[in-house]
């Protein structure tokens, strides 16, 4: 297994929607034709994964049916989106990327990126 | 040119297995996924799975987990789909397609399940 | 999973005449893909990414739409165009088709 350097912003703030995207950029050393990226989400230590696709030559990213994740592809960089964020879905989104194919296998960990996510003021009672 | 060929038409009994070739040329095999599609008489068009070729990686619709087998043999770029404890349901036109696109087909395997 | 369905199911039109055909998914996609099928043959791709024609495809077809709703157009339907089209989504597992709309000679 061989170490790879993985970039990704620091601070993303979800939409009202509860939507968040950001980029995940890695430093392929050769050219993979398959590529595994997982978003794992820590918060109090603990460690669980949110999402995750295998991608070959296509420009979009496809993930399980009841994934919170849709994203594309552009050359090393993977563009992720997270939907459906509430305010206890607050906390550090790490992006792992893995060269599945071909040899050697490459392994690449992002330092996270700290997604804020404010729940909406629901809207006052109008009289009108 | 890219080409994908498959085995020719199969007739097998209820309970029974077949296993479906779909070889490639024309391109690196292993820069592209490997697709089955399913087609039964009159019917339309139903994903069963795909297979990465380099690292055998594969993702199969649940509806046909348990009963369909995928896999490759890179050293001849080919690409077999094996469906087991076969039933009447099962009989249909088996295709391979290429990629995230579906952009080259086989031209199909007629795999029929008669008693 | 995602389902699409596909308006019209049948559709009766005449060489020359302008055709839309409607692709509505249950949930909301990235992109779409269309494919022309004809009776005894593989499927052909017609376009993908929702709008980008693939490689010899004639200019008369085109592609639009996004979210949950995309539209397949003949702008002038050609005898050889006679066939069932499909679109396809590859936005989450399993990819699923539509139905199909067969397009036939009025």
């Known amino acids: 297994c061989k170490a790879m350097h993985v970039a990704q912003p620091a601070v993303v703030l979800a939409s009202s929607r509860g939507i968040a995207s950001f980029v995940c950029e890695y430093a392929s050393p050769g050219k993979a034709t398959e590529v595994r990226v997982t978003v794992l989400r820590q918060a109090d230590s603990q460690v669980t994964e949110v999402c995750a696709a295998t991608y070959m030559m296509g420009n979009e990213l496809t993930f399980l049916d009841d994934s919170i994740c849709t994203g594309t592809s552009s050359g090393n960089q993977v563009n992720l989106t997270i939907q459906g964020l509430r305010a206890m879905d607050t906390g550090l989104y790490i992006c792992k990327v893995e060269l599945m194919y071909p040899p050697p296998y490459y392994l690449g960990i992002g330092n996270g990126t700290q997604i804020y996510v404010i729940d909406p003021e629901p809207c006052p009672d109008s009289d009108f | 040119q890219v080409q994908l060929v498959q085995s020719g038409a199969e007739v097998v009994k209820p309970g029974a297995s077949v296993k479906v070739s779909c070889k490639a040329s024309?391109?690196?095999?292993?820069?592209?996924?490997i697709n089955w599609i399913k087609q039964a008489p009159g019917q339309g068009l139903e994903w069963i799975g795909r297979?990465?070729?380099?690292?055998?990686?594969?993702y199969y619709n649940e509806m046909f987990t348990g009963r369909v087998t995928l896999t490759r043999d890179t050293s001849t770029s080919t690409a077999y789909i094996e469906l087991s404890s076969l039933r009447s349901e099962d009989t249909a036109v088996y295709f391979c397609a290429r990629g995230d696109y579906f952009d080259y087909w086989g031209q199909g395997t007629m795999v029929t399940v008669s008693s | 999973d995602i389902q699409l369905t596909q308006s019209p199911s049948f559709l009766s039109a005449s060489v020359g005449d302008r055709v839309t055909i409607t692709c509505s998914a249950s949930?909301?996609?990235?992109?779409i893909h269309w494919y022309q099928q004809k009776p005894g043959k593989a499927p052909k791709l017609l376009i993908y990414d929702t709008s980008t024609l693939a490689s010899g495809v004639p200019s008369r077809f085109s592609g639009s739409g996004s979210g949950t709703e995309f539209t397949l157009t003949i702008s002038s339907l050609q005898p050889e165009d006679f066939a069932t089209y499909y679109c396809?989504?590859?936005?989450?597992?399993?990819?699923?088709f539509g139905q199909g709309t067969k397009l036939e000679i009025k």
């Open positions: 024309g391109y690196t095999f292993t820069s592209y996924w």
């Open positions: 297979i990465a070729p380099g690292s055998g990686t594969t």
């Open positions: 949930k909301s996609v990235s992109y």
């Open positions: 396809q989504q590859r936005t989450t597992y399993p990819l699923t």
